[in-house]
C-alpha cells in the first residue's frame, strides 16, 4: 500500500469572529496505527489544539467518529472563533511508540484568517477651542478588526475632507489591527452646527460603513462683534446707550460698562438669542444720568468671552 | 443652487440569499419638487421596485422619512433577497407634472449581486456494472448558485482525480447557475469499498465545501475466481471435491456441478464469507460415490455470477 499522506485540502479558511471554523484533514491510509493531533504553528513553539488520544478540548469537535478504526477523516471544528485564533493549523499523524508516540507526517497546513469587525469609531477633537480661520485636528480611532485592509474617510457636513493622515497598526502580521487617523479642519464662522464624520469601511461590514461623529461646537470659539449705539429717549436728562454683542459662541460672556474708564456695572449674559447658525446675540443697555456729568462721557462696553482677553467698544456721549 | 445630482455611492452590493439589501441613494438638492422611484434595469423594460408617491411594495422599506419635503436620503432596503433579485438598481428623480411626472435625473446604478449557495451535489454512477480495469463515468450536479465562479473536484478514496470534464451553465449572465461534471474512473478489484466524492467550493460556503458521494460498490462487478480441489476422505468409496469461489461482488451467484457434462446439483449461494476488501467467497462441495463409476470422472464447477455468462472449472477424478 502507498505510504500515508496527510491531506489538508484548504490552503486557507476565512471565518467571521463568533462563528465556527472547520479545518479539514484526511489520511490516505489506515496505517501506521497511531493518533492524530492538530497544532497551531510549527516548530518547537507550536500550540496543541486537539489530541485524538487524550486531553480536554472544549471548543473543538470532530467532524467524524475518530474512535472508529477505519476512519480517514480527521477534520475538526473550532467554535466561537476570535481574532486570537488566527494562524496556520497543522494536522499531524503520529505513529504508535514508546515511551512516546512518534511524529510520522504533517499536513501542509491551513491558514485560518479571522474576519473581525472594527469597533465603533471614536472621534475626539482638540482640547482647547479655536477661532474661525484656524485649523483644528480631530482624531478617529477604531480597534480589533481583521483582516488589515480598511478604508477611512473624513467628512465635514457631508463634504469629503482630504487633509488627513491615517495609520494602521501594527505594520506586521497580527491577530487584529487598529486604525488611527488625524484630520485637519479649517474652522469657519458658520461651523457651530457643523459635524465631522469619520467613516470606516471594512469587508466585515458588508458595505454598511461605521461612522463616528464630533460636533465642531465643542471645538470652536466665535468671538463676538460689539456695536455701541445711543437710543432716543423721551426724558431729557437721561441717555440710553446699548451694547449689541453679536454672533458669539459658546455662551459664556461677561459684560462691563465703564464710564470714563471707571466700572459702572458688570453683567453676566443669561437670556441669549440664538441665531440660525448656532451663535448667540445679547444686548445690554446703560441709562446715563446726564445731569451728573458736566463734560462729554466716554462709555465703554467691555466684553470677556469664554475666558479670553476682553474686547471693548467705546462711545462718546456728548453732554450738551 | 446647483442642479440636483442623484448619488448612488455604491457601484455594487453583494448580499447573501435570504438577507436584506440596502441600496443607497441621496439627492444633492431639494429641487425640483417631485417623487423618486427605484427601478431594476434601464430602458423601456425596466422594473419598478419602489415608488415614493404610490403603490404597495411589501419587501421595500425606506431608510429615511420619505414623506418629508426636506429629505435628501432615498435609500431603500429590500428584504429576503433571492437570486432573482440580482441586477442593476437605479434611483431616479422625477419632476412633478401632469398627466404624468417627468423623469428628471437618474443615479449611476448599483449592481446587486446575490450570493446563493449551491444545492447539495448529487452524484450518480453508471446504469450497468463494469468489471475491474474498465472505466466508468460518474456525474455530479449542483444548482442554484451565484456568483458563477465555482470549483469542483473529484476524489476517489481521498485521492484527487484528474480525468473529468465540467460545465457551468448558462454561459452568459444569469440570476443563478448550475454545474455538471463527468468523471471517468478506472475500476480496480479492491474498489468495492471505494467511494467517489464530488466536492464543490463556492464563496457562499465560507471554506466549508459541499460533498456528494457515490459508492463504487454500485458500479463494480468483480467476477469470481474458481478453484476445484479434492479433499482427503476416510471412506474409500467416497471422494469429496470442493469448488472454492473467491473474490466476487456483488453477492448474486448460482453454482452447478456437472459429472461428465451432466448436471448433478445446482445451488444458490447464501451464507457467504465477506473479505476485507468487500468481495465475497463461497465454497461448495460434491461427494462422489466412486463405486458408481468405472472410469475416471470429469467434475465441472459452473458458476453464473450476477446474471453474466457462466464460468467453469473442471477436475478429473481418477477412479483407481
Amino acid at each position: 500500500e502507498d505510504e500515508l499522506q496527510v491531506i489538508q485540502p484548504e490552503k486557507s479558511v476565512s471565518v467571521a469572529a463568533g462563528e465556527s471554523a472547520t479545518l479539514r484533514c484526511a489520511m490516505t491510509s489506515l496505517i501506521p496505527v497511531g493518533p492524530i493531533m492538530w497544532f497551531r504553528g510549527a516548530g518547537a513553539g507550536r500550540e496543541l489544539i486537539y489530541n485524538q488520544k487524550e486531553g480536554h478540548f472544549p471548543r473543538v469537535t470532530t467532524v467524524s467518529e475518530l474512535t472508529k478504526r477505519n476512519n480517514l477523516d480527521f477534520s475538526i471544528s473550532i467554535s466561537n472563533i476570535t481574532p486570537a485564533d488566527a494562524g496556520t493549523y497543522y494536522c499531524v499523524k503520529f505513529r504508535k511508540g514508546s515511551p512516546d508516540d512518534v511524529e510520522f507526517k504533517s499536513g501542509a497546513g491551513t491558514e485560518l484568517s479571522v474576519r473581525a469587525k472594527p469597533s465603533a469609531p471614536v472621534v475626539s477633537g482638540p482640547a482647547v477651542r479655536a477661532t474661525p480661520e484656524h485649523t483644528v485636528s480631530f482624531t478617529c480611532e477604531s480597534h480589533g478588526f481583521s483582516p488589515r485592509d480598511i478604508t477611512l474617510k473624513w467628512f465635514k457636513n457631508g463634504n469629503e475632507l482630504s487633509d488627513f493622515q491615517t495609520n494602521v497598526d501594527p505594520a506586521g502580521d497580527s491577530v487584529s489591527y487598529s486604525i488611527h487617523s488625524t484630520a485637519r479642519v479649517v474652522l469657519t464662522r458658520g461651523d457651530v452646527h457643523s459635524q465631522v464624520i469619520c467613516e470606516i469601511a471594512h469587508i466585515t461590514l458588508q458595505g454598511d460603513p461605521l461612522r463616528g461623529t464630533a460636533n465642531l461646537s465643542e471645538a470652536i470659539r466665535v468671538p463676538p462683534t460689539l456695536e455701541v449705539t445711543q437710543q432716543p429717549m423721551r426724558a431729557e436728562n437721561q441717555a440710553n446707550v446699548t451694547c449689541q454683542v453679536s454672533n458669539f459662541y459658546p455662551r459664556g460672556l461677561q459684560l462691563t460698562w465703564l464710564e470714563n474708564g471707571n466700572v459702572s456695572r458688570t453683567e453676566t449674559a443669561s437670556t441669549l438669542i440664538e441665531n440660525k447658525d448656532g451663535t448667540y446675540n445679547w444686548m445690554s443697555w446703560l441709562l446715563v444720568n446726564t445731569c451728573a456729568h458736566r463734560d462729554d462721557v466716554v462709555l465703554t462696553c467691555q466684553v470677556e468671552h469664554d475666558g479670553q482677553q476682553a474686547v471693548s467698544k467705546s462711545y462718546a456721549l456728548e453732554i450738551s | 443652487e446647483d442642479e440636483l445630482q442623484v448619488i448612488q455611492p455604491e457601484k455594487s452590493v453583494s448580499v447573501a440569499a435570504g438577507e436584506s439589501a440596502t441600496l443607497r441613494c441621496a439627492m444633492t438638492s431639494l429641487i425640483p419638487v417631485g417623487p423618486i422611484m427605484w427601478f431594476r434595469g434601464a430602458g423601456a423594460g425596466r422594473e419598478l421596485i419602489y415608488n415614493q408617491k404610490e403603490g404597495h411594495f411589501p419587501r421595500v422599506t425606506t431608510v429615511s422619512e420619505l414623506t418629508k419635503r426636506n429629505n435628501l436620503d432615498f435609500s431603500i432596503s429590500i428584504s429576503n433577497i433571492t437570486p432573482a433579485d440580482a441586477g442593476t438598481y437605479y434611483c431616479v428623480k422625477f419632476r412633478k407634472g401632469s398627466p404624468d411626472d417627468v423623469e428628471f435625473k437618474s443615479g449611476a446604478g448599483t449592481e446587486l449581486s446575490v450570493r446563493a449557495k449551491p444545492s447539495a451535489p448529487v452524484v450518480s454512477g453508471p446504469a450497468v456494472r463494469a468489471t475491474p480495469e474498465h472505466t466508468v463515468s460518474f456525474t455530479c450536479e449542483s444548482h442554484g448558485f451565484s456568483p458563477r465562479d465555482i470549483t469542483l473536484k473529484w476524489f476517489k478514496n481521498g485521492n484527487e482525480l484528474s480525468d473529468f470534464q465540467t460545465n457551468v451553465d448558462p454561459a452568459g449572465d444569469s440570476v443563478s447557475y448550475s454545474i455538471h461534471s463527468t468523471a471517468r474512473v478506472v475500476l480496480t478489484r479492491g474498489d468495492v469499498h471505494s467511494q467517489v466524492i464530488c466536492e464543490i467550493a463556492h464563496i457562499t460556503l465560507q471554506g466549508d465545501p459541499l460533498r456528494g458521494t457515490a459508492n463504487l460498490s454500485e458500479a463494480i462487478r468483480v467476477p469470481p475466481t474458481l478453484e476445484v480441489t479434492q479433499q482427503p476422505m476416510r471412506a474409500e468409496n467416497q471422494a469429496n471435491v470442493t469448488c472454492q469461489v473467491s473474490n466476487f461482488y456483488p453477492r448474486g451467484l448460482q453454482l452447478t456441478w456437472l459429472e461428465n457434462g451432466n448436471v448433478s446439483r445446482t445451488e444458490t449461494a447464501s451464507t457467504l464469507i465477506e473479505n476485507k476488501d468487500g468481495t465475497y467467497n463461497w465454497m461448495s462441495w460434491l461427494l462422489v460415490n466412486t463405486c458408481a463409476h468405472r472410469d475416471d470422472v470429469v467434475l465441472t464447477c459452473q458458476v453464473e455470477h450476477d446474471g453474466q455468462q457462466a464460468v467453469s472449472k473442471s477436475y478429473a477424478l481418477e477412479i483407481s
Partner: antibody, heavy 118, light 107 residues
Framework: EVQLVESGGGLVQPGGSLRLSCAAS????????MHWVRQATGKGLEWVSV???????YYPGSVKGRFTISRENAKNSLYLQMNSLRVGDTAVYYC????????????WGQGTMVTVSS | DIQMTQSPSSLSASIGDKVTITCRAS??????LAWFQQKPGKAPKSLIY???SLQSGVPSKFSGSGSGTDFTLTISSLQPEDFATYYC?????????FGQGTKLEIK
C-alpha cells in the same frame, strides 16, 4: 413643536401698503417651500404666492405685480409685501409650509386679518 | 388656470354616517390633490396629500382616492368633531387652486 405665527395684519386704505410676517419655529425653515393663502370672510381659500427653497417665486394673476413674497432664512421668517391694496384683498392671510415631499401643505399658521377699507 | 369643482356644496349627515365628497379638476392633475378641513374661525388643517396619503396624525377614518381629474374624500364614521368645511386643492402646477368647499352639517 413645529409652528407658524403670522403678524402684521391690520386696517389699511385702498392703495396703501402692508407687510405681513410669518415666524417659523421647530423646523429647518430653509429646507421648505413656503406659501401664503388667503380667505375672505365667508368665502373659500385662495392661494396667493410661494417662495421656493432656492428663492424662486410665483403668484396668481390677481396679485401679480402688487404683492412680493420674500424670506429671511437666518431669521426663520417669511414675508408678504402688499402694495396697491384693494378692497378685494380684504381677508385672513395664512402662511403654510409645503412640508410633504410633493410640496403639499402640512402646517398652517393661525392667520392674520387684513382689512382694506376707506 | 386649473379649475377645481367640489360637490356637493353642502351636505347634512348624522353621527356614524359614512360620507363622500367629490372633487373634479378641469384638466388632468395626475394625483397632486390635497384635502383640508376647516372649522369656523380656525386655520385649515391638512388631511390628505397625493390624493390618498394621510398626513401624519390624521385618523384613518379619512381616506382619499382618485387620479387624473376625479377624486373623492370619504369619512367612514362621522363624529361630532368632523362637522366642518372641506376643501380640495390641486398643486401640480402654479397657480395652485382650491375647490369652493363643501360644508358638512349635522342633520
Amino acid at each position: 413643536e413645529v409652528q407658524l405665527v403670522e403678524s402684521g395684519g391690520g386696517l389699511v386704505q385702498p392703495g396703501g401698503s402692508l407687510r405681513l410676517s410669518c415666524a417659523a419655529s421647530g423646523f429647518t425653515f430653509s429646507s421648505y417651500d413656503m406659501h401664503w393663502v388667503r380667505q375672505a370672510t365667508g368665502k373659500g381659500l385662495e392661494w396667493v404666492s410661494v417662495i421656493g427653497i432656492a428663492g424662486d417665486t410665483y403668484y396668481p394673476g390677481s396679485v401679480k405685480g402688487r404683492f412680493t413674497i420674500s424670506r429671511e432664512n437666518a431669521k426663520n421668517s417669511l414675508y408678504l409685501q402688499m402694495n396697491s391694496l384693494r378692497v378685494g384683498d380684504t381677508a385672513v392671510y395664512y402662511c403654510a409650509r409645503g412640508g410633504s415631499w410633493d410640496d403639499a401643505f402640512d402646517i398652517w399658521g393661525q392667520g392674520t386679518m387684513v382689512t382694506v377699507s376707506s | 388656470d386649473i379649475q377645481m369643482t367640489q360637490s356637493p356644496s353642502s351636505l347634512s349627515a348624522s353621527i356614524g354616517d359614512k360620507v363622500t365628497i367629490t372633487c373634479r379638476a378641469s384638466q388632468d392633475i395626475n394625483n397632486y390633490l390635497a384635502w383640508f378641513q376647516q372649522k369656523p374661525g380656525k386655520a385649515p388643517k391638512s388631511l390628505i396629500y397625493t390624493a390618498s396619503s394621510l398626513q401624519s396624525g390624521v385618523p384613518s377614518k379619512f381616506s382619499g382616492s382618485g387620479s387624473g381629474t376625479d377624486f373623492t374624500l370619504t369619512i367612514s364614521s362621522l363624529q361630532p368633531e368632523d362637522f366642518a368645511t372641506y376643501y380640495c386643492q390641486q398643486y401640480v402646477s402654479y397657480p395652485y387652486t382650491f375647490g369652493q368647499g363643501t360644508k358638512l352639517e349635522i342633520k
